[in-house]
Interface confidence: medium
C-alpha cells in the first residue's frame, strides 16, 4: 500500500488527492552526512551530488570486507527517504552527500566537524538557497560538536539530527543535545515510540518532535531498483529533513526559529503512547509527530509558541535551573515544576542581553525544572514588572502599567522554604486581565509585552476539591503564552504548557495526609496578534 | 537542549605556571578545560580538538598549533596537526600523546580541548 510513513506525514484532508506542496523541496539543498551512497539508484539518480568530501575512520576488524552495497546501505536509504522518486518525502529536493561514516556506519566527532566546516565553506564560496543539513548519527555528549552545530545554525543553516537509538535521554548524546539542532525521535505505524531490539528511540527534553522511523521503505543499495525496509531515528530525521525542505521551498525566507515553530505547530499532537517512556521523562518528552503543513502559505499568520524545558537543577538547596529560548524567539512567560513539590518558584532574568527563565529549588527538594514559553512575535518589546511580597491578606499583585503593554505571563518567587505554612490570600480580584496575583509571601513578576496588534486575555479553570491535574486551554485562534497556578495552593508541583493547554500539577493530598481543602486552579494567558491576522488577509 | 549539560566528563586544569616564560602567557587564574566522552568505549584518545576562544583571530589557529608542536618537540613528543578550523570554530585537530594535554591547556587563546570520540549511524 502507500507507505504508511508517507501517509502519516500527509495532512488528513489532503490524503484523498495525495496533496504535495508545489516544487516539492526543489529550492532547497539537503546535505547528508552519512555513509557513501549509491547515487545511480533509480530513486535518487540525477538528484544527488556526491561531494568529494570523505573523512572516515578505518573499519574495525582484520576480516572486514568492504562490500560496496553494505558500505552504501545506510546513506542510500536515507537519501531515498529525503528525496526519492517513489518513497521520498521531498521529491524535488536536491541532495549533496558527504561521507563521514565508514562501511560499518562508524565515524568520528572530528571527521563530522570537518564535514560541517566543508558545508560552511561551500556556503561562503557559493551562496545558494536554503540549506538543510541532515545528521543521521549520534555520539556521546560533545561540547565541540554542539558548538559547531550552533555556529552553523547561526549562519542560517537548518540542522536536523537523529535523537539516537539508545532508549535513553537524548540530552546525553550529540548532536541530539545541541539546542539549535532539530532533534527527531522515531515512532511507528501505531504511534508507539520505536523499539529497536532491546533498545529504541531516545526521548526527553532534547527531542523536538518525533517522526515515522519503523519499517520505512526506501532505496536499497543491493541493486539500482531495490527497495528495503529500515528502522531507526535516522529514518525519522530524514522525514523531518524532507518536510523542512518542502516548507523552505514554499517559504525560502523562513528562519530556523520559524521553521521549528511551524514543524511543532503542524505536528500531530498527543498521539504517542507515552507509557513507553520512563515515567520521569514523560512530561519532558514532546508528544508530537511531524507532518507536512496543510497548505504552503498563510502558515505564518499566527502567533507561534513552544515550550522549552531546562535541564534538571539537581537537589542542592540553592540549585537553580535555567530555560532559554532560541535566538529569534521571545520569552513570554516562565514557570517551574518539581516532582517533590519543594520549589521556590521562578522568575524571568536578563542574561547576556536575552531574557531567560530561572527556577529555584527549595530545601529538601529533589530539584526543579524551569519551563520557558518561547514565541515568535515580530517587533515585540517585553519587560518584567515585579512586586515584592505584600505580606497582606490580599496577596501580592502586579500589573502591566505601560501604555500598550499586555500581560503575557505571571511568575512568582519566594524565599520562605514552604509557602504551605503561610496562609494563602483569601481573595482573588477578578476581571483584571493585566494583573498577576500571588501569595502574600512571594514576589510576583508580570511579563508585559508590546507588539503591533497584540491582545491577550486571562482564562482560569478551578476545581473545588484537590486534583492531581487541572488544565485550561486556549480556544482556536488564540495561543497560550502564559501558564501558572492560582496562588495559594501549597501542594502545587508546578505548571507548564503542553501545546495550547496549561497544565497545573498537584501532589495527591490523600497520600500526604493533608486535610487541605484548597482548590487547585490553572491560569492561562491566551494571546493573538491582530496585526498578523490582518497581514494574512492582505496577502490573500 | 542545552550546551551546559550532558553526562560528559570535564577535567578542569588551572593554568598555574608561566609556560616556558612566554611573553603572551595567559593571565593568572584563567582556565581552559578538557572534555572527553562519558561513554568509555566511544573514546578515541590520541586525537584532540583544540578550541580557541571565540574572539580569536583566524591566524591564531595556525600559530597556536605551531606553538604546540614546537613545545611538544622540545619535550621529545611528536605531534601531527590533522586539520585547522577557520569557518566554524577557531581551533585545530591534533594527533598527540595525552601526556601533552596539560601543556596544550596552558597555551594562550585556548578555550577548551576535547578528546575525539566515535559517532554512529542511527
Amino acid at each position: 500500500s502507500i507507505p504508511w510513513n508517507l501517509e502519516r506525514i500527509t495532512p488528513a484532508r489532503y490524503r484523498a488527492d495525495e496533496y504535495q506542496p508545489p516544487k516539492g523541496g526543489s529550492l532547497v539543498e539537503v546535505y547528508l552526512l552519512d555513509t557513501s551512497i549509491q547515487s545511480d539508484h533509480r530513486e535518487i539518480e540525477g538528484r544527488v551530488m556526491v561531494t568529494d568530501f570523505e573523512s572516515v575512520p578505518e573499519e574495525d576488524g582484520t576480516r572486514f570486507h568492504r562490500q560496496a552495497s553494505k558500505c552504501d546501505s545506510h546513506g542510500t536509504h536515507l537519501a531515498g527517504v529525503v528525496s526519492g522518486r517513489d518513497a521520498g518525502v521531498a521529491k524535488g529536493a536536491g541532495l549533496r552527500s558527504l561521507r563521514v561514516l565508514n562501511c560499518q556506519g562508524k565515524g568520528t566527532v572530528s571527521g563530522t566537524l570537518i564535514g560541517l566546516e566543508f558545508i560552511r565553506k561551500s556556503q561562503l564560496v557559493q551562496p545558494v538557497g536554503p540549506l538543510v543539513v541532515l545528521l543521521p548519527l549520534a555520539g556521546g555528549y560533545s561540547r565541540v560538536f554542539n558548538a559547531a552545530c550552533q555556529r552553523l545554525a547561526r549562519a542560517g543553516v537548518v540542522l536536523v539530527t537523529a535523537a539516537g537509538n539508545f532508549r535513553d535521554d537524548a540530552c546525553l548524546y550529540s548532536p541530539a543535545s545541541a539546542p539549535e539542532v532539530i532533534t527527531v525521535g522515531a515512532t511507528n505505524a501505531q504511534d508507539q515510540p520505536v523499539t529497536l531490539g532491546t533498545l529504541g528511540t531516545n526521548f526527553g527534553r532534547c527531542v523536538d518532535l518525533f517522526a515515522p522511523g519503523e519499517d520505512i521503505i526506501g532505496a536499497s543499495s543491493d541493486c539500482s531498483t531495490c527497495f528495503v525496509s529500515r528502522s531507526g531515528t535516522s529514518q525519522a530525521a530524514a522525514h523531518v529533513a524532507g518536510i523542512a525542505a518542502m516548507m523552505l521551498s514554499a517559504e525560502p525566507e523562513l528562519t530556523l526559529a520559524e521553521l521549528r515553530q511551524r514543524l511543532i505547530h503542524f505536528s500531530a499532537k498527543d498521539v504517542i503512547n507515552e507509557a513507553w517512556f520512563p515515567e520521569d521523562q514523560r512530561v519532558l518528552t514532546p508528544n508530537l509527530v511531524a507532518a507536512l503543513p496543510p497548505s504552503t502559505h498563510r502558515a505564518g499568520w499566527q502567533l507561534f509558541c513552544r515550550t522549552v524545558w531546562s535541564a534538571h537543577s539537581g537537589p542542592t538547596r540553592m540549585a537553580t535551573a535555567v530555560a532559554r529560548c532560541a535566538q529569534d524567539e521571545e520569552l513570554l512567560s516562565c514557570s517551574s515544576f518539581s516532582r517533590s513539590g519543594k520549589r521556590r518558584g521562578e522568575r524571568i532574568e536578563a542574561q547576556g542581553g536575552k531574557r531567560v527563565c530561572r527556577a529555584h529549588n527549595a530545601f529538601g527538594g529533589e530539584g526543579v525544572y524551569a519551563i520557558a514559553r518561547c514565541c515568535l512575535l515580530p517587533q515585540v518589546n517585553c519587560s518584567v514588572h515585579t512586586a515584592p511580597p505584600a505580606g497582606a491578606s490580599m496577596g501580592t499583585r502586579v500589573h502591566c502599567h505601560q501604555q500598550g503593554h499586555v500581560l503575557t505571563g505571571c511568575s512568582s518567587h519566594w524565599e520562605v522554604e514552604d509557602l504551605g505554612t503561610h496562609k494563602p490570600p483569601v481573595l482573588r480580584p477578578r476581571g483584571q486581565p493585566n494583573q498577576c496575583v500571588g501569595h502574600r509571601e512571594a514576589s510576583i513578576h508580570a511579563s508585559c509585552c508590546h507588539a503591533p496588534g497584540l491582545e491577550c486575555k486571562v482564562k482560569e479553570h478551578g476545581i473545588p476539591a484537590p486534583q492531581e491535574q487541572v488544565i485550561v486551554a486556549c480556544e482556536d485562534g488564540w495561543t497560550l503564552t502564559g501558564c501558572s497556578p492560582l496562588p495559594g495552593t501549597s501542594h502545587v508541583l508546578g505548571a507548564y504548557a503542553v501545546d495550547n493547554t496549561c497544565v497545573v500539577r498537584s501532589r495527591d493530598v490523600s497520600t500526604t495526609g493533608s486535610t487541605s481543602k484548597e482548590a487547585v486552579a490553572a491560569v492561562a494567558i491566551c494571546c493573538r496578534s491582530r496585526h498578523l491576522v490582518q497581514a494574512s488577509q492582505e496577502l490573500q | 537542549q542545552e550546551d551546559e549539560d550532558g553526562d560528559y566528563e570535564e577535567l578542569v586544569l588551572a593554568l598555574r605556571s608561566e609556560e616556558d616564560g612566554l611573553a603572551d602567557a595567559p593571565e593568572h587564574g584563567a582556565t581552559a578545560t578538557f572534555h572527553r566522552c562519558a561513554k568509555d568505549p566511544w573514546r578515541l584518545p590520541g586525537t584532540y580538538v583544540v578550541v580557541l576562544k571565540e574572539e580569536t583571530h583566524r591566524s591564531q589557529s595556525e600559530r597556536t598549533a605551531r606553538r604546540l608542536q614546537a613545545q611538544a618537540a622540545r619535550r621529545g613528543y611528536l605531534t601531527k596537526i590533522l586539520h585547522v578550523f577557520h569557518h566554524l570554530l577557531p581551533g585545530f585537530l591534533v594527533k598527540m600523546s595525552g601526556d601533552l594535554l596539560e601543556l596544550a591547556l596552558k597555551l594562550p587563546h585556548v578555550d577548551y580541548i576535547e578528546e575525539d570520540s566515535s559517532v554512529f549511524a542511527q
Partner: antibody, heavy 118, light 113 residues
Framework: EVQLVESGGGLVQPGGSLRLSCAAS????????MNWVRQAPGKGLDWVST????????NYADSVKGRFIISRDSSKHTLYLQMNSLRAEDTAVYYC???????????WGRGTLVTVSS | DIVMTQSPDSLAVSLGERATINCKSS????????????LGWYQQKPGQPPNLLIY???TRESGVPDRFSGSGSGTDFTLTISSLQAEDVAVYYC?????????FGQGTKLEIK
Amino acid sequence: EVQLVESGGGLVQPGGSLRLSCAASGFTFNNYAMNWVRQAPGKGLDWVSTISGSGGTTNYADSVKGRFIISRDSSKHTLYLQMNSLRAEDTAVYYCAKDSNWGNFDLWGRGTLVTVSS
Amino acid sequence: DIVMTQSPDSLAVSLGERATINCKSSQSVLYRSNNRNFLGWYQQKPGQPPNLLIYWASTRESGVPDRFSGSGSGTDFTLTISSLQAEDVAVYYCQQYYTTPYTFGQGTKLEIK
C-alpha cells in the same frame, strides 16, 4: 538460493487450529514485509495477511480477522500463520510471499495445502 | 475494498500472435505523489505458484521476457504479450497494492488456439 518453503498444512476439522510456517533463505529476512496468500481449489488468488519487516505492523483480510494471527521470528528467518476456528471455506493452498515492500509479491513459496473437512 | 475485474475470463491466441488482457479497478490506484500506479501482473502456470511479471503497471520484473508489457493508468490496465509462445500458457492475474486489503482480479486463462 533465494527461496521460501511452506510447511504445516494438512487435514483439520472445522473449528480446529493449524499453524503454518514459512522458512526464508537467500535474502535479508528482517528487511522485508511478508504475506500469506491463499488459493482455493480451482479458484483465484486471495490475499490473507501481511506483516512488516520488524513485525510491528500487521494487516488481515476481513474474512480471517480475529481468527488468524501472522507473526515472524527474525532469528529463525521464519514466517508463521496461526489459524484458529477454521471453516470449510478456508480450504486452500496457502502461499507464503515476500513483499517488495510496496505490496506486490516478488517471491513465492510452492504452497502448502490446508483442508478443512469433517 | 478495491475490486479488480479482469476481461476476458479466458482467451485463446495462436502462437506468435498478440494476446491482450484487461484489468479494471473499482477506484484509481494511481498515487499522485509519485505518479505510480500500484498495480502488478502475475503469471501462474499449472501446478506452480504465481510469478511476478510486471509492477508499477508497466515495469518488467527482472528476468521477464520483453514480449510481456504492461500499460494503463488510474483504473484501466492492460497486459500485452506481443508474440505468444507455448510456455506462456497460464492463468494471469492483476493485483492492486494501493491499499490493504490487497486484491487480485479473478484471473484470465490464456490458451493456444
